[in-house]
Amino acid sequence: PLATIPVSTTSLTSSEGSTISTPSVDISTPVTTSIVGDQCSRCKNGGFWDGLKCQCLTPYYGESCEEVVNSIDIAPPETVSAQMELTVTVTSVKFTDELKNHSSQEFREFNKTFTEQMNIVYSGIPEYVGVNITNLRLGSVVVEHDVLLRTKYTPEYKTALDNATEVVKQKITKVTTEQIMTNDNCSALMCFNTTGTQVQNITVTQYDPVEECRQKAEEYEDYFLVEYRDQKPYCISPCESGFNASKNCNHGKCQMSQNGARCLCVTTETHWYSGEDCNQGTQKSHHHHHH
């Protein structure tokens, strides 16, 4: 969590005489009690007693797993990728049986030359990682291959990868139109059949921080939301401070319940505080409000 909430504790004495400290916080959450061996612990909300303490499940914490965290760790991948399945027809190489065998010298040489050619074609695309030949077949050489793209995760990663796939299409179309055989000879590193270029399929990494946040928040899914800071997503409840969605409890403490975030107002030596945001103070000695 980005912030820790101090919890006052009450001492309970177990039947064996040992003392267990449990947070004395009133929270309307479902309660399940985990009993392991002789050790009876009040591990609520699916938490379990490991012999020393309650091991809580997300999104709970506290000595009895009775409190809801203010933020949940969500970890987007550092990089996201796209894979484009393409087919091109190379006319400057005649198909031979050796090309079927991926461990043959011929295949290795073809793979090296094809990779060099594609590296030239796609130079200038920052997301371009490389190509991977999946199959070679007759006609002259029909090259089934994957173009691999990768970029740093940002909230706009899909747009970046979609744009990159469009540039790949443009560049492969251009090269297979321009680098063609003349008089049965090719002057380029490789020549192509213009009509043999096809994009079969495009697969883009799917990552949705909102979905991950909702899944991890479980029954609190409606109250946790994703906010970005420095392009990094944070899964927060309104009780997490420092975000646009943060709830200001003024003279009180924010606490999550199954009905959402609420403010628990404090009473000081001089004032009672009330109101939804604990912003209405009543002086104890003089009974008038001031805002």
């Epitope: 006319t91 400057s92 190489v93 005649k94 031979t96 050796e98 010298q105 011929e106 040489e109 073809f110 090296k112 030359t113 060099e116 055989m181 049965d184 000879n185 090719c186 002057s187 380029a188 590193l189 490789m190 020549c191």
Partner: nanobody, 123 residues
């Protein structure tokens, strides 16, 4: 490991002849493509003549009818018979090879190269 050794270069008068040879070791002689390239001082390497495993040949326009490429698979040797030589044929001649059946005159497509043999044609 493929190794190519070119020889047969020399100095000749315009109109004369030379026969270049290239001994290939570690190269499956019945497969792929063998070629001759040349490079004149200050110029790019250019394809001169090409021969495929099935005997298909192709030539640069500038040497057609004057140069003949051939290969002996049994001897793993490549030849270039050069007749009616001209001063513009002067340069370093290299033999090159690929395990692939290539139809490209681009030097970058050929991974295996011999050291050059110098041909000088004076007028």
């Amino acid at each position: 490991d493929v190794q190519l050794q070119a020889s047969g270069g020399g100095s000749v008068q315009s109109g004369g002849s030379l026969r270049l040879s290239c001994a290939a070791s570690g190269f499956p002689s019945s497969r792929g493509t063998m070629a001759w390239f040349r490079q004149a001082p200050g110029r790019e390497r250019e394809g001169v003549a090409f021969i495929n495993s099935d005997g298909r040949t192709s030539y640069a326009e500038s040497v057609k009818g004057r140069f003949t490429i051939s290969r002996d698979n049994a001897l793993s040797t490549l030849w270039l018979q050069m007749n009616s030589l001209k001063p513009e044929d002067t340069g370093m001649y290299y033999c090159a090879a690929s395990l692939l059946y290539l139809m490209t005159v681009n030097a970058a497509a050929y991974p295996y190269w011999g050291q050059g043999t110098q041909v000088t044609v004076s007028s």
